[in-house]
């Protein structure tokens, strides 16, 4: 969470943003928000990103304004139009690339004065692993797929019974460059598996953090899977 | 839920003032504007002001400048709004509405204030 | 201030009607009104949001529609709970403005 405030006493707004990560390929929300003003003809809102000479996205007199946008991000960028007389300036970022990552700033205006806060946007792939019992394979085996990693992450397993127990003599664990040449798929096989167990595949980069749980009881299987992503803290 | 809770009825009378409160729960009271809408009978909305709690900034409608006084305590996250040198034509009901989620979403069930001698 | 004119004021029309009822402001407002309905002794009860937005728990008979100085509300096919006094709200330009309300009335 980053607040910044704007210049001189009466003339400074409070604007806050929050650090978030893009997912490639898919579209993405740079979050910011502002104390809110009544003369939504009067606020302007603008992002602008470092090392980037034109505008990502201006809003003013209730309109986008898309004059001066950059052209790497010409037709990928929207605000939230019927939300910015909240105090909502967020940005959403459509077909989210490797390229969007770095420091963006959150620029207001309002008639009742100045702000701004900046955002560090980090962009990778990250997906929900699944898995599986291995039927193929000689003994008991789990295998723990997900279809886009991006950096290259690191896999842990852990079991609920075997706490603290290092499984990476027992695991064995690939990364298949997808077709677009950037993502990769990974898949982690866990060896020697017991019965009446809860396992889970750990899949972990800078960005995202995923856990695929698997209990294998000789009656039924149980999945869960959730993903985290890894915001870095305020500045 | 978001709830505005409005004071009760008033009977004035012409010259005095009114002081009318609105009690808001299930949202930060602080972080949005709250407003000010009177209907007078069998007529239309008119906006009398807002306020922005958590600065005390107020706007006001040019036609009640000098005449409406919009507060907010909060600690109780209560607003209130006060008119002063009543006239007949101020009879009405008196409506808090906030901009939470968006313009005017949630309302008091309003204030009915008669102005008469 | 913006002036924005609705109309009709009234109208009579039954269950299953169709009713239009449009608001025109004296300048662009850029999509920036709600709806609002009103019962006698009620306030007014949010409907739809920025032209074209319906609120939580608004049915989808209702909706919205228009941009620059002309705005409608449609009522697909009315029903007995819709019978109240309609207003819009222009919110773009300081101070905000209602339209004067239009009264749908049982034929």
């Known amino acids: 969470l980053i607040i910044g405030f704007g210049i001189s006493g009466r003339h400074s707004i409070t604007v806050t943003t929050v650090a978030s990560a893009g997912n490639i390929g898919e579209d993405g929300i740079l979050s910011c928000t502002f104390e809110p003003d009544i003369k939504l003809s009067d606020i302007v809102i603008q992002w602008l990103k470092e090392g980037v000479l034109g505008l990502v996205h201006e809003f003013k007199e209730g309109k986008d304004e898309l004059s001066e946008q950059d052209e790497m991000f010409r037709g990928r960028t929207a605000v939230f139009a019927d939300q910015v007389i909240v105090g909502n300036a967020s940005l959403r970022l459509k077909n989210v690339q490797l390229t969007d990552a770095g420091t963006y700033k959150c620029y207001i205006i309002t008639s009742k004065g100045k702000g701004n806060a900046n955002l560090e946007y980090k962009t990778g792939a990250f997906s929900m692993p699944e898995v599986n019992v291995d039927y193929n394979a000689s003994s008991e085996t789990l295998r723990c797929e997900a279809p886009r990693w991006f950096p290259q992450p690191t896999v842990v397993w852990a079991s609920q019974v075997d706490q603290g127990a290092n499984f990476s003599e027992v695991s064995n664990t690939s990364f298949e460059l997808n077709s677009e040449n950037v993502t990769m798929k990974v898949v982690s096989v866990l060896y020697n598996v017991t019965i009446n167990n809860t396992y889970s595949c750990m899949i972990e980069n800078d960005i995202a953090k995923a856990t695929g749980d698997i209990k294998v009881t000789e009656s039924e299987i149980k999945r869960r899977s959730h993903l985290q992503l890894l915001n870095s803290k305020a500045s | 839920q978001v709830q505005l809770v409005q004071s009760g009825a008033e009977v004035k009378k012409p010259g005095a003032s009114v002081k009318v409160s609105c009690k808001v729960s299930g949202y930060p009271f602080t972080s949005y504007w709250m407003h000010w809408v009177r209907q007078a009978p069998g007529q239309g909305l008119e906006w009398m002001g807002a306020?922005?709690?958590?600065?005390?900034?107020?706007e006001y409608a040019q036609k009640f400048q000098g005449r409406v006084t919009l507060t907010a305590d909060t600690s109780t996250s209560t607003a209130y709004m006060e008119l002063s040198s009543l006239r007949s034509e101020d009879t009405a009901t008196y409506y808090c509405t906030s901009t939470w989620t968006h313009y005017f979403d949630y309302w008091g069930q309003g204030t009915t204030v008669t102005v008469s001698s | 201030d913006i002036q924005m004119t609705q109309s009709p004021s009234s109208l009579s029309a039954s269950v299953g009607d169709r009713v239009t009822i449009t608001c025109q402001a004296t300048?662009?407002?850029?999509?920036?009104l709600n709806w609002y309905q009103q019962k006698p002794g009620k306030p007014p009860k949010f409907l739809i949001y920025?032209?074209?937005q319906l609120a939580e728990g608004v049915p989808s008979r209702f909706s919205g529609s228009g941009s620059g100085t002309d705005y409608t509300l449609t009522i697909s096919s009315l029903q007995s709970e819709d019978f109240a006094t309609y207003y819009c709200l222009q919110f773009y330009e300081f101070p905000p403005t209602f339209g004067g309300g239009t009264k749908v009335e049982i034929k």
């Open positions: 306020i922005y709690p958590g600065k005390s900034d107020t």
């Open positions: 920025y032209t074209a």
């Open positions: 300048q662009d407002i850029v999509k920036s």
